[in-house]
Interface confidence: medium
């Protein structure tokens, strides 16, 4: 094995090309200069190296850059990125959105790998906040990205970035996440007129408080049942029958099909049966006529 460490005469690589696929692992190790490899990384992907040969090339880069690869190399890793461990990636300082895009392309169509999760984490931390361009890029590759963040992480999203969010990006968000995102969306879309505003804010309404729902009910928005069913129960309960009717418009008829599900079920229990009857939908379970409703939460607050 010892004599194999020197590069055989005439085998020293002058450039990264297809002739290298015929090199044994030890020849690659001995005959390919790591600095040459680093400057010609963009060629590697188009050469049919075996997995073992790629391991050698990665090893050479690791030796050349023990503190982490420079961005000029990272940007051209191509599918060699799949060979990187999260530990490798934690050493990187990726600042260019182009580099991030290049590496996300490699993983496109596949679920988010630990490598990609680490890369995104490093990139976002390096930027200090989830700016619009970054969010645009990440949600384009991973529609569920936003909902994978904790409420704390979401708090660093500036309102301006909300413009990049599509309804499908919020599909897997839970109420705690929408609680954080809704005020940002409200701020982002505040200068839009009524109908345009509703179209944009609709997917964030799972974080809306009662007073905002009341305000929307005055704007003839015709909220669909799917959106209504995603509203916070505590925000829906104080709404009157008249307000819900105005909020849903022609979609109010859909309440019947959802009367056993939250938040509709809980809301029905809080309404007077007389008021529910005015909808003509046959909703049952309201407070019978003649009963006095005491709001104990209000009473506790006063005492």
């Amino acid at each position: 094995e010892v004599e194999k460490t020197a590069c055989p005469s005439g085998k020293k690589a002058r450039e990264i090309d297809e002739s290298l696929i015929f090199y044994k692992k030890w020849e690659l190790e001995a005959c390919v200069d790591a600095a040459l490899l680093a400057t010609q990384m963009d060629r590697v992907n188009a050469i049919p190296f075996t997995y073992e040969q790629l391991d050698v090339l990665k090893h050479k880069l690791d030796e050349l850059y023990p503190q982490g690869y420079p961005e000029s190399v990272i940007q051209h890793l191509g599918y060699l990125f799949l060979k990187m461990s999260p530990e490798d990636i934690r050493k990187w300082n990726v600042t260019s959105l182009e580099t991030l895009k290049a590496l996300l392309e490699v993983n496109k169509g596949h679920e988010m790998s630990p490598q990609v999760a680490t890369l995104i984490d490093r990139f976002v931390k390096g930027r200090g906040q989830l700016d619009k361009d970054t969010l645009d890029t990440l949600t384009a590759f991973y529609p569920g990205y936003l909902c994978s963040l904790s409420p704390e992480e979401l708090s660093s999203v500036p309102p301006s970035s909300i413009w990049a969010v599509r309804p499908q990006d919020l599909d897997t968000c839970d109420p705690r996440q929408l609680d954080v995102l809704y005020p940002k969306a409200r701020l982002a879309f505040q200068n839009m007129n009524g109908s345009e505003y509703f179209v944009k804010i609709q997917s964030f309404l799972g974080g809306a408080p009662t007073e905002d729902l009341k305000a929307l009910s005055q704007q003839n928005v015709s909220m669909d049942l799917a959106t209504f069913m995603k509203l916070r129960t505590d925000a829906v309960l104080p709404l009157t029958v008249a307000e819900v009717q105005k909020l849903l418009g022609p979609h109010v008829e859909g309440l019947k099909a959802e009367e056993r599900h939250r938040p509709v079920r809980d809301w029905i229990l809080r309404q007077r049966q007389d008021d529910l009857d005015t909808l003509g939908l046959g909703l049952q379970g309201g407070i019978p006529n003649g009963y006095l409703v005491l709001d104990l939460s209000m009473q506790e607050a006063l005492s």
Partner: antibody
Framework: QVQLQQPGAELVKPGASVKLSCKAS????????MHWVKQRPGQGLEWIGM????????NYNEKFKSKATLTVDKSSSTAYMQLSSLTSEDSAVYYC?????????WGTGTTVTVSS | QIVLTQSPAIMSASPGEKVTMTCSAS?????MYWYQQKPGSSPRLLIY???NLASGVPVRFSGSGSGTSYSLTISRMEAEDAATYYC?????????FGAGTKLELK
Amino acid sequence: QVQLQQPGAELVKPGASVKLSCKASGYTFTIYWMHWVKQRPGQGLEWIGMIHPNSGNTNYNEKFKSKATLTVDKSSSTAYMQLSSLTSEDSAVYYCSLIHWYFDVWGTGTTVTVSS
Amino acid sequence: QIVLTQSPAIMSASPGEKVTMTCSASSSVSYMYWYQQKPGSSPRLLIYDTSNLASGVPVRFSGSGSGTSYSLTISRMEAEDAATYYCQQWSSYPLTFGAGTKLELK
């Protein structure tokens, strides 16, 4: 969702040629090597070769060098394999596939039947 | 080229039984890959880099080995595991597959 779409079957005459297609979607076509694999009825898998869509570089199994020609059309994200001078030995299912460390994607395969 | 020899060619196992099949390489390889193929379907990657489970593969599958000797183990056989299993190497060209081990349900 990464997908490789292949036509279900091709019936060809002995001595003729056939060009099999593999349409890729759901990923960046130019990044990954596209592989072609042969499987005769009731037999194992044989690697034919691979092509890099961006550069057009190819790497063939010596056994198939005079039988198969791999090409790509980047504009339609489609890989092709032309099989020439067909004989009954070439009757098989031909798969296109992406094989990469921790993931793989295979087409559904095209059944080529060589018969007069 | 590297020849991969799988054994046994055919085997059967009862549900819950432990199953082990082997793959022997004609010369040393660094990694082994394992595929599962059911009749009428395309192959599916089970194990990459000798011992890592591919996405969505049940944890009852495991791989091990080094050099010229590798194995695939199913800790507890299930009916859906009845299939043909192929080993594959990418240490040198051409890429080669083993002839397969057909696993039947007893």
